[in-house]
Interface confidence: low
């Protein structure tokens, strides 16, 4: 039976140009993480392997950076970015946990006049 | 729309060079990783060497038939590849492609490397 | 190096068909695998990237399958266009390498 819970960053904000951290943490289960992918829709952006590490798809490679930890930095934002992204964690034996976050990436002014621009 | 396109292709002699180039539009250039890929007639893909965008540092990665011989460079004005060759063999004869990340390819241009 | 192999040349199936086609890493590539159509005299096709992502306008009957070492390009209701030679390669690591090709023809 699967008993873990995923806890996410939930919807963030972030300024066009600038940089953000996805994090997603699982919970209540003593499964072991296989593989962790982000998705950004039905895009894969990267994979955290537990034996083999990290690896960027290429076609992201110049704007994400793996971490910290399983999460996910994004860099050079653009308003292109704004959507949802999901964790998706594999593990033995419970099977796949998925978390969701949404990313609204504003324009400068927005993000410099208004309260919804955060760092996690 | 995404295009490429080869050219510089011909005919040399064994220790020669000849400096390929890849005529790009319809994108960034700046912003993506660009690839040769070799095919010897009647042969399989080879993957040759890339040289990745700016915010990569334009850094470079070579297979080992290549490395030391061949030299990938990107003229980023003009949004041009490029891939000299030196010390020219036999087998390097092949129609040369460059690609983009993303699966975009050119239609290849044609080294015969022949006495 | 990551040898990529492709176990058969050649395969002949009738129109209409289905055929698969499989490549075998000699380490894991976690699905970094892409799949390219080749006609003679043009440029290869990118099929499928990500061992299962179908790229736009290419037709649903090709599908790509596999994890780890082993991967498959699936083609069902063989047309006289699907004829060509076709290659996996990985990009999991540097260098990124291609399998020898796979030729298909029609019976």
């Known amino acids: 039976m699967m008993t873990g819970t995923i806890e996410t960053t939930g919807n963030i904000s972030a300024e066009k140009g600038g940089s953000i951290i996805l994090q997603c943490h699982l919970s209540s289960t003593t499964a072991q993480v296989t593989q962790v992918n982000w998705e950004q829709q039905d895009q894969l952006l990267a994979i955290c392997n537990a034996d083999l590490g990290w690896h960027i798809s290429p076609s992201f490679k110049d704007r994400v950076a793996p971490g910290p930890g399983l999460g996910l930095t994004l860099q050079s934002l653009t308003v292109n970015d704004t959507g949802e992204y999901f964790c998706i964690y594999h593990t033995y034996p419970d099977g796949t946990y998925t978390g969701r976050i949404f990313l609204e990436v504003l324009e400068s002014s927005v993000a410099e006049h208004g309260a919804r621009f955060q760092i996690p | 729309e995404v295009n490429l396109v080869e050219s510089g292709g011909g005919l040399v002699q064994p220790g020669g060079s000849l400096r390929l180039s890849c005529a790009t539009s319809?994108?960034?250039?700046?912003?993506?990783?660009m690839s040769w890929v070799r095919q010897p007639p009647g042969k399989a893909l080879e993957w040759l060497c890339l040289?990745?965008?700016?915010?990569?540092?334009?850094?470079?990665e070579y297979s080992a038939s290549v490395k030391g011989r061949f030299t990938i460079s990107r003229d980023n004005s003009q949004s041009i590849l490029y891939l000299q060759m030196n010390t020219l063999r036999a087998e390097d004869s092949a129609t040369y492609y460059c690609?983009?990340?993303?699966?975009?390819w050119g239609q290849g241009t044609t080294l015969t490397v022949s006495s | 190096d990551i040898q990529m192999t492709q176990s058969s040349s050649y395969l002949s199936v009738s129109l209409g068909g289905r055929v698969t086609i499989t490549c075998r890493a000699s380490d894991h590539i976690n699905n970094w695998l892409a799949w390219y159509q080749q006609k003679p005299g043009n440029a290869p096709r990118l099929l499928i990237s990500g061992a299962t992502s179908l790229e736009t306008g290419v037709p649903s009957r090709f599908s790509g399958s596999g994890s780890g070492k082993d991967y498959t390009l699936s083609i069902t209701s063989l047309q006289t266009e699907d004829v060509a030679t076709y290659y996996c390669?990985?990009?999991?690591?540097?260098?990124?390498?291609f399998g020898s090709g796979t030729k298909l023809e029609i019976k």
């Open positions: 040289i990745r965008n700016k915010a990569n540092g334009y850094t470079t």
């Open positions: 690609a983009r990340d993303g699966g975009y």
């Open positions: 390669q990985q990009y999991w690591s540097i260098p990124f390498t």
């Open positions: 319809g994108f960034t250039f700046n912003d993506y990783y």
